[in-house]
């Protein structure tokens, strides 16, 4: 299925879920995070959460990043081929991403970026 | 490109267990969703169960007490159990698989008829 | 559950005139501004088919006389001008809350 169309959801509430939702991720590992499936370790400061969802729209049926997909979805704006950023040439564990993304979306919150 | 085929017996007796296997080509059930989906003859369509590529797996609630669900990741197929069929379960069963977010069924296998008579 | 209510059970339409197609869910499928409704199309004797995502997103190789709209618990599929080819039953079905369900289907034929 192609890169979904995407409408925009409110970005503090969404934010504070994601970050939840993240931190839950984190904490919940007992085993290997989505089989230990490896993404684009995309530039997130260049990319922001479209790139972000990019990288893990790649990432096929895993549970467990499920509502993370769907809250990165509402805070990305823009068709995924809209998004301008260099392309990665990295592949890092979902779970080292999810990390990331974790910490990259506590200074969004933090700094009200 | 992905491809489903469903297999199992035609012909059911009352009280008896069912069986069906769903067998996927060109992706790893590691990572990638089969749900189980019926029809009766000329009515609408009624979703069973899905097994996600990580494990997780859900159940219709009406007929919850009666599937279950699971895969061999070895073999690439995934087996649908329902107990206690009667004939009012007489359908063509589908598999379809969903591979990417946002996880609708765009994969669907020919479907598996299955009449449930003494 | 989320139940799915579709209008008409059944539409009969000219060729080359629009059609309409109806689902109401019990509940919002919508979730983080994005709706979890998918339209399907099946043909007689076939399987069904993956023809709309996320309420208004064409599946690749769909003719774009096809369209969907609606957020929150009302959705609609339209036929901008219908084809010989169109004759079928239409199905909505979400995927916001386990389990998934399915409409009960809109057959649409050729007046």
């Known amino acids: 299925t192609p890169g979904p169309v995407r409408r925009s959801t409110s970005p503090p509430v969404a934010l504070r879920e994601l970050i939840e939702e993240l931190s839950n991720i984190t904490q919940d590992q007992k085993t290997s995070l989505c089989n230990s499936s490896m993404v684009w370790s995309v530039d997130l400061t260049a990319g922001g959460f479209c790139a972000a969802l990019e990288s893990l729209t790649n990432i096929s049926s895993c549970n467990a990043i499920h509502r993370t997909q769907r809250i990165l979805n509402g805070l990305c704006n823009q068709k995924a081929s809209d998004v301008a950023s260099s392309p990665p040439d990295t592949k890092i564990e979902v779970a080292q991403f999810i990390s990331k993304l974790l910490n990259y979306s506590k200074q969004l919150f933090r700094y009200g970026h | 490109q992905v491809t489903l085929r469903e297999s199992g017996p035609a012909l059911v007796k009352p009280t008896q267990t069912l069986t069906l296997t769903c067998t996927v080509s060109?992706?790893?059930?590691?990572?990638?969703?089969v749900n189980w989906i019926r029809q009766p003859p000329g009515k609408a369509l009624e979703w069973l169960a899905m097994?996600?590529?990580?494990?997780?797996?859900v159940y219709n609630s009406a007929l919850k007490s009666r599937l279950t669900i699971s895969k061999d990741t070895s073999k690439n197929q995934v087996v649908l159990t329902m107990t206690n069929m009667d004939p009012v379960d007489t359908a063509t069963y589908y598999c379809?698989?969903?591979?990417?977010?946002?996880?609708?069924?765009?994969?669907w296998g020919q479907g598996s008829l299955v009449t449930v008579s003494s | 559950d989320i139940v799915m209510t579709q209008s008409p059970d059944s539409l009969s339409v000219s060729l080359g005139e629009r059609a309409t197609i109806n689902c109401r869910a019990s509940?919002?499928?919508?979730?983080?501004?994005?709706?979890?409704m998918h339209w399907y199309q099946q043909k007689p004797g076939q399987p069904p088919k993956l023809l709309i995502y996320?309420?208004?997103n064409l599946e690749s190789g769909v003719p774009d006389r096809f369209s969907g709209s609606g957020s929150g618990t009302d959705f609609t599929l339209t036929i901008s001008s219908l084809q010989a080819e169109d004759v079928a039953v239409y199905y909505c079905?979400?995927?916001?809350?386990?389990?998934?369900?399915f409409g009960g289907g809109t057959k649409v034929e050729i007046k």
């Open positions: 379809a698989g969903d591979g990417y977010f946002p996880y609708a069924m765009d994969n």
């Open positions: 060109g992706a790893s059930l590691s990572a990638y969703s």
């Open positions: 097994i996600w590529g990580d494990g997780k797996i």
């Open positions: 509940k919002s499928v919508d979730s983080y501004g994005n709706s979890y």
């Open positions: 996320l309420a208004s």
């Open positions: 079905q979400q995927n916001n809350e386990d389990p998934r369900t």
